[in-house]
């Protein structure tokens, strides 16, 4: 079904994200003790590593952008602070129409 299909897409996205993070860490010289915010997969989308004070913008996952083709919509941001990543802004639910991925049970 469509949920099983989307489950596969998200697993693939997660694997790609972890690869991207690893490459970005190497490029930026990031390690576990580096100041800043490590890259992460937040179960919805991928966040690249960032320096303190940096704002990172991401689009809603492609799976959901099908329903929101407008280019100035479906964008979520996080700030990298000394305490780590801020909460997503706006909330995923408001910007993308969902707030977490449901796997088929």
């Amino acid at each position: 079904g469509s949920m099983a299909h989307s489950d596969g897409i998200f697993k693939k996205e997660q694997a790609m994200c972890l690869e991207k993070i690893q490459r970005a860490n190497e490029l930026m010289g990031f390690n576990d003790s580096s100041p800043g915010c490590p890259g992460m997969w937040d179960n919805i989308t991928c966040w690249k590593p960032a320096h303190v004070g940096e704002m990172v913008l991401v689009s809603c996952p492609e799976l959901f952008r099908i329903f929101n083709p407008d280019q100035d919509m479906g964008v979520v941001s996080r700030n990298c602070t000394e305490d780590g990543w801020s909460e997503p802004f706006p909330h995923y639910f408001d910007a993308c129409g969902f707030d977490e991925y449901e796997s088929e049970t």
Epitope: F67, N68, D70, D72, M73, V75, P90, H91, D94, A95, G97, F98, D99, E100, E102, T105
Partner: antibody, heavy 123, light 107 residues
């Protein structure tokens, strides 16, 4: 045809709890594409979104900060309805209360509304 | 909270007129904006969602536009049933907030 039918008392005493119910026909409170909202309208505050409940494998709620400490929105799956409870009411809570269905298409919008219930807070 | 303002607060028009109502958000909201119509004693009715999309069953004389902070609702060839109050609503930052309304009455 989606219809929302509201019920509940029109008069509540100060400090007591305002309770309203919204019965859903033509849809289900467990619809994973919908949200179920409460909104109120008064001359002094205009239209004010109070909060919503929705089901996405588990039940979730979002509440407006202005009422967060006093509000509860509960679904009732057995009757396909949802309710509003607002505690410790004051005369400022006097308003017409509406329930509404939220749907997503590029953004969230309220596409079906209940008929409205005028609730007066007075002793 | 995001503040929504509307202008004018009221306007008088005649059947057949073309009218425009403006809505402004206190911060950027992209196109996350809806328009509703309300008649006395009735619940609001959805007209336009996501700035410019016409809700099913709404006549094509209604149209919406705008992005960012400035939005407009236009009614081409005003009909007798269009005399009502119109509200905009932002739908990106909770709590979702509404404009104060624009009342359209008969000249």
């Amino acid at each position: 045809q989606v219809q929302l039918q509201q019920s509940g008392p029109g008069l509540v005493k100060p400090s007591q709890t305002l309770s309203l119910t919204c019965a859903i026909s033509g849809d289900s409170v467990s619809n994973k594409q919908a949200t179920w909202n409460w909104i109120r309208q008064s001359p002094s505050r205009g239209l004010e979104w109070l909060g919503r409940t929705y089901y996405r494998g588990k039940w979730k709620n979002h509440y407006a900060v202005s009422v967060k400490s006093r509000i509860t929105i509960n679904p009732d799956t057995s009757k396909s309805q949802f309710s509003l409870q607002l505690n410790s009411v004051t005369p400022e809570d006097t308003a017409v209360y509406y329930c509404a269905r939220g749907m997503w298409n590029q953004n969230w919008f309220l596409d079906h509304w209940g008929q409205g219930t005028l609730v007066t807070v007075s002793s | 909270d995001i503040q929504m303002t509307q202008s004018p607060s009221s306007l008088s028009a005649s059947v057949g007129d073309r009218i425009t109502i403006t809505c402004r958000a206190s911060q950027q909201i992209a196109r996350y904006l809806n328009w509703y119509q309300q008649k006395p004693g009735k619940a609001p009715k959805l007209l336009i969602y996501a700035s410019y999309n016409l809700q099913s069953g709404i006549p094509s004389r209604f149209s919406g536009s705008g992005s960012g902070t400035d939005f407009t609702l236009t009614i081409n060839s005003l009909q007798p049933e269009d005399f009502a109050t119109y509200f905009c609503q932002q739908a990106i930052i909770q709590p979702y907030t509404f404009g104060p309304g624009t009342k359209v009455d008969i000249k």
